[in-house]
């Protein structure tokens, strides 16, 4: 089971107007160059088998993913946007750096995996896809953390 | 295809007891969370209470002490244990699998099954 | 807990109508929030989830919107079949369990 004290974010964090319309006009505009509607990354193939007390570690997962290997190599895309959103972001990530599973993680790595796979294939339409995705990432995230 | 079907339902007088079962297929417990919803007649939709796949349980305020939700992975069947039943508890009693998107969406549901309280 | 206002509570529209029903949330819900559709007799089913997003096999004529604490639900021309009650659902996190879950009192849509 997660050490859950350490897997959860402030609901503050997600009650900043300014920086959640960011998110979301940042996922808007990737998504308009999404050409890939078939595919989506946040969904329930992500979550299954994931109880209620893991959801927040596996979605660690997948934000750290998210800005290491996609958001940092486009940061010089979809301005002004990603100069506000990946520091937001990156904040929340390293609240959550605490944030462990004791035991058995195998399922979690094997769905986050799923979803890095899915990128990597798609290329950079993959990492387009992923920012277009924010808006879930970032209401994903709350939903499982706070 | 992923079934569920609810029974157990039936004629109980008040302060009686009653388990329903749902019984599920085309689908593992070990993998979804499953929820217990009711709706009295004429009236609207209620949450009772969810067990979730490590087998933890959580319920609506009003439901606590009443009412226990248990599974049998072996059997692929929920379980919903009411007691002390009053006339207000007559009711369709549903059964839905809960479908974890980034958001709880309860999808699919049983047929329901009819508790009727009174003496 | 949150408390989730439908209006109207019942209407009345013939085929091909535009409908449009409201859910208002007593709380900030951001985009949690689900459309259900229940024929009488029936189980609910699932229409939209994320406030917007259509559930699979769902025609398209149904659409939702909104976030934050109002949201609606759209049938652009009105069906046979969709002559139902509409429930709205919320998800609210972070607080006690024993309130995540919210349906609202759901609006009955008759022929004309």
């Known amino acids: 089971a997660p050490i859950s004290s350490h897997c959860r974010l402030d609901k503050s964090n997600f009650q900043q107007p300014y920086i959640t319309n960011r998110t979301f006009m940042l996922a808007k505009e990737a998504s308009l160059a999404d050409n890939n509607t078939d595919v989506r990354l946040i969904g329930e193939k992500l979550f299954h088998g994931v109880s209620m007390s893991e959801r927040c570690y596996l979605m660690k997962q997948v934000l750290n993913f998210t800005l290491e290997e996609v958001l940092f190599p486009q940061s010089d895309r979809f301005q002004p946007y990603m100069q506000e959103v990946v520091p937001f972001l990156a904040r929340l990530s390293n609240r959550l750096s605490t944030c462990h599973i004791e035991g058995d993680d195998l399922h979690i790595q094997r769905n986050v995996q799923k979803l890095k796979d899915t990128v990597k294939k798609l290329g950079e339409s993959g990492e387009i896809k992923a920012i277009g995705e924010l808006d879930l990432l970032f209401m994903s995230l709350r939903n499982a953390c706070i | 295809e992923v079934q569920l079907v609810e029974s157990g339902g039936g004629l109980v007088q008040p302060g009686g007891s009653l388990r329903l079962s749902c019984a599920v297929s085309?689908?593992?417990?070990?993998?979804?969370?499953m929820i217990w919803v009711r709706q009295a007649p004429g009236k609207g939709l209620e949450w009772i209470g969810i067990?979730?796949?490590?087998?933890?349980?959580y319920y609506a305020s009003w439901a606590k002490g009443r009412f226990t939700i248990s599974r049998d992975s072996s059997k692929n069947t929920v379980y919903l244990q009411m007691n002390s039943l009053r006339a207000e508890d007559t009711a369709v009693y549903y059964c839905a699998r809960d479908r974890f998107v980034g958001v709880d969406i309860f999808e699919p549901w049983g047929q329901g099954t009819l508790v009727t309280v009174s003496s | 807990a949150v408390v989730l206002t439908q209006s109207p509570s019942s209407l009345s529209a013939s085929v091909g109508d535009r409908v449009t029903i409201t859910c208002q949330a007593s709380e900030d819900i951001y985009t949690n929030l689900a459309w259900y559709q229940q024929k009488p007799g029936k189980a609910p089913k699932l229409l939209i989830y994320?406030?917007?997003t259509l559930a699979s096999g769902v025609p398209s004529r149904f659409s939702g919107s909104g976030s934050g604490t109002d949201f609606t639900l759209t049938i652009s021309s009105l069906q046979p079949e969709d002559f139902a009650t509409y429930y709205c659902q919320a998800c609210v996190y972070g607080n006690s369990a024993d309130s995540r879950y919210t349906f609202g009192g759901g609006t009955k849509v008759e022929i004309k």
């Open positions: 085309g689908f593992s417990l070990s993998s979804y969370a």
């Open positions: 067990i979730d796949i490590d087998g933890s349980t």
């Open positions: 994320w406030a917007s």
